[in-house]
Amino acid sequence: SSPGKPPRLVGGPMDASVEEEGVRRALDFAVGEYNKASNDMYHSRALQVVRARKQIVAGVNYFLDVELGRTTCTKTQPNLDNCPFHDQPHLKRKAFCSFQIYAVPWQGTMTLSKSTCQDA
């Protein structure tokens, strides 16, 4: 029989560094899900992470407040990581999103639990 999951005392969310590998992976995942769900032909990427928090439960909940910007790259293009942001006023678009990502890192899994975005 495999070891079960013991009950755990859950602490509240704590501030996390954007330099943390876990935060970076959660951000990439959330932005990827945002782009999959959006009907925009252009790819968006993070302009800045306004706040990052994490809460360790049975896995890890990441709470990310992110400002997203629309890039000049269409979603079909390869290598979207360094696409420049649109600077033409009629194409420029920003969104402010709050993402909650649930990760079980030792299982290699991530789920977008909550996502709320509004135009900035």
Partner: antibody
Framework: EVQLLESGGGLVQPGGSLRLSCAAS????????MNWVRQAPGKGLEWVGL????????YYADSVKGRSTISRDNSKNTLYLQMNSLRAEDTAVYYC??????????WGQGTLVTVSS | QSVLTQPPSASGTPGQRVTISCTGS?????????VHWYQQLPGTAPKLLIY???NRPSGVPDRFSGSKSGTSASLAISGLRSEDEADYYC???????????FGGGTKLTVL
């Protein structure tokens, strides 16, 4: 009973390649992440990397990143570790280990990889 | 240099109680991740001894116990027996490295 059987180890020259296999039985292989952990002779344990249940996600230790690839075939209940550009410091016993709970809970008996000219 | 720090050796006589410490940092144990302990008998593969800080898998005697506080954890072995002579390793997930990290191992000698 969970069983993990590693194979594919042996003597390889520096710069060479090797593919290790881990045959799993006694649990639902396709439901869980799998890991490779190594142990150099007379040294401690070092995690090499993991692969998610569906094979879509892999994480690697910095020491092997770019030189190793973990894959799995759920239809064959088998885990793989492809190692390239091997160095003397890769000499170790390589273990596969399951994560059916919250840790590395079951381990194979290991296979020895020796990198030497 | 291991990410988690353990004493290289520990010893005790039969019947005694020994403890082995494991010290981490704010990116692993201190972040709130569980600590797990492994026993490696000479010439064999590691075996899970304690998971989730304090829990024993079935078949592990209650002479083995674990605890965790802050950035450290401990493994205690009471009623020491000759068959406990082995290497003991602690492990935890690490946020910065995004992988499992281990202590350097503690060689337990039963005198």
């Amino acid at each position: 009973e969970v069983q993990l059987l590693e194979s594919g180890g042996g003597l390889v020259q520096p710069g060479g390649s090797l593919r290790l296999s881990c045959a799993a039985s006694g649990f639902t292989f396709s439901s869980y992440a799998m890991n490779w952990v190594r142990q150099a002779p007379g040294k401690g344990l070092e995690w090499v990397g993991l692969i998610s249940y569906d094979g879509r996600t892999t994480y690697y230790a910095d020491s092997v990143k770019g030189r190793s690839t973990i894959s799995r075939d759920n239809s064959k209940n088998t885990l793989y570790l492809q190692m390239n550009s091997l160095r003397a410091e890769d000499t170790a016993v390589y273990y596969c280990a399951t994560t059916t709970g919250t840790t590395l809970d079951y381990w194979g008996q290991g296979t020895l990889v020796t990198v030497s000219s | 240099q291991s990410v988690l720090t353990q004493p290289p050796s520990a010893s005790g006589t039969p019947g005694q109680r020994v403890t082995i410490s494991c010290t981490g940092s704010s990116s692993n144990i201190g972040a709130g991740y569980d600590v797990h302990w492994y026993q490696q008998l000479p010439g064999t593969a590691p075996k899970l001894l304690i998971y989730g800080n304090t829990n024993r898998p079935s078949g592990v005697p209650d002479r083995f116990s674990g605890s965790k506080s802050g950035t450290s954890a401990s493994l205690a072995i009471s009623g020491l027996r000759s068959e406990d002579e082995a290497d003991y390793y602690c492990a935890a997930w690490d946020d910065s490295l995004y992988g499992w990290v281990f202590g350097g191992g503690t060689k337990l000698t039963v005198l």
